[in-house]
Interface confidence: medium
């Protein structure tokens, strides 16, 4: 268990041309607030998917009224941190979405109007218990500066908040199975905390964050009875005699999500997946149009100007998500063939090909020997994306341009002497040996272990290796 903390430092116009106009005016004073959504892992989920690690809303910032003629300054921010408590282990890698909302305080009928001013998203690695990490994110012409950290709530410790410590009951020892919890010398590890929401009656755990079901129960939180033959309905009758139980009311019962949003249960409560054009914890906030600049990373916004019409972001290559907020890892599709190295340059995909292959995706197998000459009578041999020369006798090297020393490998056996020859090498054998490499002993009676020596060569003569 622990808390993710987000500190917003500034929200204002980013550097460069095209400074945004102030979101507030004398006629329409407003104030800002922020929403953070956290998801575990380096999530590629859509922006609308549940904030499985949790979400938080900031307080409202001070009321701001634009000074006529002045450029948009950094806008006044709400006090305090945004805190997202997590009950289970801190995942180490997480995805975040930080939304900047504007609350207009003019004379609206029905109270203040909310609209999304900017949304930034990212994926990060973060160990719990570490220092504050600083970040800058840009959304259109706006720039958001913030810091974040994850810290464990006692008794949890460690980079994932999974080591659970509690004060020792005695100075000398811990309880059964409770090891001393370094570096806290006076503490001991404590019982595991199961996955948040794990039924205390029907579930248990032997690892932090897990939820194992007792017999007769199922579901991720062990709240669903295993149906038996005596259960007539899918959820089972509410009768003690049948052994079937109706789970208690779920957080999504009655669907708390407005405007057609769909509800999904989370360990904490529920999460609404909102249709395009609606936001908020219960999809109660509408009014995002192309005028609000909801498309990031150069996405093209298409949609009507009235608040009720949905907008669509057409994303440039390399980005996806309903607001083009997520970079696509196009290399994960392994587009480069034949072992080519994939490089995602943002604006384009590049394949760096291995030798012997070419083409945008390294799809062409080059003729390795085309245009490759092997010198001194060598012949080119193709293979494995690289050419190789089979050199004529007396030559070596990649292209057969180097004259070889045939005697370098000491080819003559039994003390024979090697002589380089224009056509190869010649071995002068020591007495008692014969053969091209002096490899055969001469028998005492003058016969050899080989067939008779070729005509013109007596045993003991130098043998030329052709």
């Amino acid at each position: 268990a622990g808390v993710f903390e987000l500190q917003i430092h500034s929200f204002g116009p980013g550097p460069g041309p095209g400074a945004p106009r102030s979101p507030c005016s004398a006629r329409l004073p407003c104030r800002l607030f922020f929403r953070v959504c956290l998801k575990p892992g380096l999530s590629e989920e859509a922006a609308e998917s549940p904030c499985a690690l949790g979400a938080a809303l900031s307080a409202r910032g001070p009321v701001y009224t634009e000074q006529p003629g002045a450029p948009a300054p950094d806008l006044p921010l709400p006090d305090g941190l945004l805190q997202v408590p997590f009950r289970d282990a801190w995942p180490g890698t997480f995805s975040f979405i930080i939304e900047t909302w504007r609350e207009e305080l003019g004379d609206q009928i029905g109270g203040p109007a909310w609209s999304l001013l900017a949304r930034v998203a990212g994926r990060r690695r973060l160990a719990a218990g570490g220092p504050w990490a600083r970040d800058i994110q840009r959304a259109g012409a706006w720039e958001l500066r913030f810091s974040y950290r994850a810290r464990c709530e006692p008794p949890a410790v460690g980079t994932a908040c999974t080591r659970l410590c509690r004060p020792r009951s005695a100075p000398s020892r811990c309880g059964p199975g409770l090891r001393p919890c370094a570096p806290l010398e006076d503490e001991c590890e404590a019982p595991l905390v199961c996955r948040a929401g794990c039924s205390p009656e029907h579930g248990f755990c032997e690892q932090p964050g897990e939820c194992r079901c007792l017999e007769g129960w199922t579901g991720p939180l062990c709240t669903v009875p295993v149906s038996t033959s005596s259960c007539l309905s899918p959820r089972g009758p509410s009768s003690a005699t049948t052994g079937c139980l109706v789970p208690g009311p779920g957080p999504c019962d009655g669907n708390p999500c407005a405007n057609g949003g769909s509800c999904s249960e989370t360990p904490r409560s529920f999460e609404c997946t909102c249709p395009r054009g609606f936001y908020g914890l219960r999809c109660e906030v509408s009014g995002v149009t192309c005028a609000d600049g909801p498309c990031f990373n150069g996405g093209l916004c298409v949609g009507g100007a009235d608040p009720d019409s949905a907008y669509i972001c057409h994303c440039p290559p390399g980005f996806q998500g309903s607001n083009c907020e997520k970079r696509v890892d196009r290399c994960s599709l392994q587009p480069c063939r034949n072992g080519g190295l994939c490089l995602d340059l943002g604006h384009a995909l590049r394949c760096r090909c291995r030798a012997g292959f070419a083409g945008p995706r390294c799809e062409h197998d080059l003729d390795d020997c085309a245009g490759r000459a092997c010198a001194n009578g060598g012949t080119c041999v193709e293979g494995g994306g690289a050419h190789r020369c089979s050199c004529a006798l007396g030559f070596g090297g990649r292209d057969c341009r180097e004259r070889a020393d045939p005697c370098a490998a000491r080819p003559c056996a039994h003390g024979g002497r090697c002589y380089a020859h224009f056509s190869g090498l010649v071995c002068a054998c020591a007495p008692g040996y014969m053969g091209a490499r002096c490899e055969f002993p001469v028998h005492p009676d003058g016969a050899s272990a080989l067939p008779a020596a070729p005509p013109g060569l007596r045993p003991g003569d130098p043998q030329r290796y052709l």
Partner: antibody
Amino acid sequence: EVQLVESGGGLVKPGGSLKLSCAASGFTFSSYAMSWVRQTPEKRLEWVAAINSNGGNTYYPDTVKDRFTISRDNAKNTLYLQMSSLRSEDTALYYCARHRGGFYYAVDYWGQGTSVTVSS
Amino acid sequence: NIMMTQSPSSLAVSAGEKVTMSCKSSQSVLYSSNQKNYLAWYQQKPGQSPKLLIYWASTRESGVPDRFTGSGSGTDFTLTISSVQAEDLAVYYCHQYLSSRTFGGGTKLEIK
């Protein structure tokens, strides 16, 4: 129906050894932590040893540490307690008990017990 | 180890009466990370093994009559029998399972 049947108890001299067994049935034995709990002649209950579901972790109070060893054979649905260097204060009725889940859960089923008497 | 102290050590009541018995722990058995009290109550009838009545200090085990109620938090706990029946004659033990495992000395309930 959950059933736990202990065996192996008896009379043993101080310093002697004894091995208790507990045959489990009526539930998925390999899913539950198990314990041995004893009841003294004065009717006091004392926890003796525990083991997690896969046998990878064992737990003992100081009174029996290094003398008693708990183990389990999930294939045979059997829990064991090897007792050595027995003392007169180990005389008790020994119960095999099932936890509701892991170690940090209440015991929900008990066997009928097997009697161990340590006397010279 | 956490010491568990039960009181009274014995009591005698008539059938139909309400009875309460106390269990105190030398340290808190409330675990802050999940806000659970690691305390159980057991009933042991003469010649029988203990039977689980209550766990997490107040959760009644399935099949246990609803006249049995557990309450309390931290170090002070109570088992209440709202209307004692003749079959409730037993010794009642409290048990903490947070740090090691220790039992109270028991409260013997007799029926007048």
